[in-house]
């Protein structure tokens, strides 16, 4: 649970908000795909290493 | 809905340069939350990532590639495009321009749009 | 440089399951996609970030991602579902993207 909120809310930039990123999607699908992946990414570049 | 479509000679020389452009239509390439991708199919083979261009115009190229790939970007035509230099004939393939997801920076993920591919014969 | 080892090919009866297996190591530490490439057409996404579906891809599609293999599961095959069936990964390492070799679905009967 922590983790991935951690991760998930690093992985905003510091003037992304939830309607910037709505609005900038170019779909539906897309604005759901990237919720998915921000979610407990497995990817370092994203979330850093983590033990 | 976002749409792709690829441009370019369906013949080149070897040695020569093959150059194609994939045209975005219903998005921007200057999205940051997107990538934009070339992949190549040869004959009867499998699929072979080339390169990806970003919003900002940075690019990344398969290690395997990178010294005869270049992939650059028109953003008033909203075009991206293909350079593969002294090309051979094992160059021969149909490419793919397509796009995905870029999240939080510089994380890729997957390709969820694709052109319908351009057929490229390298030959004399 | 990071490589995915894709089986040529799987034969599947009508109706039945079939499981397509993308070796790589510790495959798990990355996000695993799947397409479908049909003759003559460009691949389709099936299968992102493991296991969900993009939206027009029917359920029966399912793929999961664990140690050194990541597996997609087709319930039910279909006879539209003979094709080529690609895995990919990015290697972040790298910043590249890499396609496992492909493996072709035969539905029989």
């Known amino acids: 649970g922590n983790l991935k909120h951690k991760c998930f809310r690093n992985s905003l930039e510091n003037n992304e908000t939830l309607e910037s990123i709505m609005n900038t999607l170019e779909s539906e699908e897309d604005f759901r795909k990237y919720f998915y992946y921000l979610e407990g990414s497995k990817d370092a570049l994203l979330c850093g290493f983590s033990t | 809905e976002v749409q792709l479509q690829e441009s370019g000679p369906g013949l080149v020389k070897p040695s020569q340069t093959l150059s194609l452009t994939c045209t975005v239509s219903?998005?921007?390439?200057?999205?940051?939350?997107?990538?934009s991708s070339w992949i190549r199919q040869p004959p009867g083979k499998g699929l072979e990532w080339m390169g990806v261009?970003?919003?900002?115009?940075?690019?990344y190229y398969s290690p395997s590639l990178k010294s005869r790939t270049s992939i650059s970007r028109d953003t008033s035509k909203n075009q991206f495009s293909l350079q593969l230099s002294s090309v051979t004939p094992e160059d021969t393939a149909v490419y793919y321009c397509a796009r995905g997801l870029r999240v939080a920076g510089s994380y890729f993920t997957d390709f969820g749009t694709w052109g319908q591919g351009t057929q490229v014969t390298v030959s004399s | 440089s990071y490589e995915l080892t894709q089986s040529p090919s799987v034969s599947v009866a009508l109706r039945q399951a079939a499981k397509i297996t993308c070796g790589g190591d510790?495959?798990?530490?990355?996000?695993a996609h799947w397409y479908q490439q049909k003759p003559g057409q460009s691949p389709v996404l099936v299968i992102y970030?493991?296991?969900n579906r993009p939206s027009g891809i029917p359920e029966r599609f399912s793929g999961s991602n664990s140690g050194n293999t990541a597996t997609l599961t087709v319930s039910g095959a279909q006879a539209e579902d003979e094709a080529d069936y690609y895995c990919?990964?990015?290697?972040?390492?790298?910043?590249?993207?890499?396609f496992g070799g492909g493996t072709h679905l035969t539905v029989l009967g």
């Open positions: 219903g998005g921007s390439i200057t999205n940051s939350y997107y990538a």
């Open positions: 261009i970003i919003y900002d115009g940075s690019t």
């Open positions: 990919q990964v990015w290697d972040s390492s790298a910043n590249a993207a890499v």
């Open positions: 970030k493991d296991s």
């Open positions: 510790n495959i798990a530490s990355k996000h």
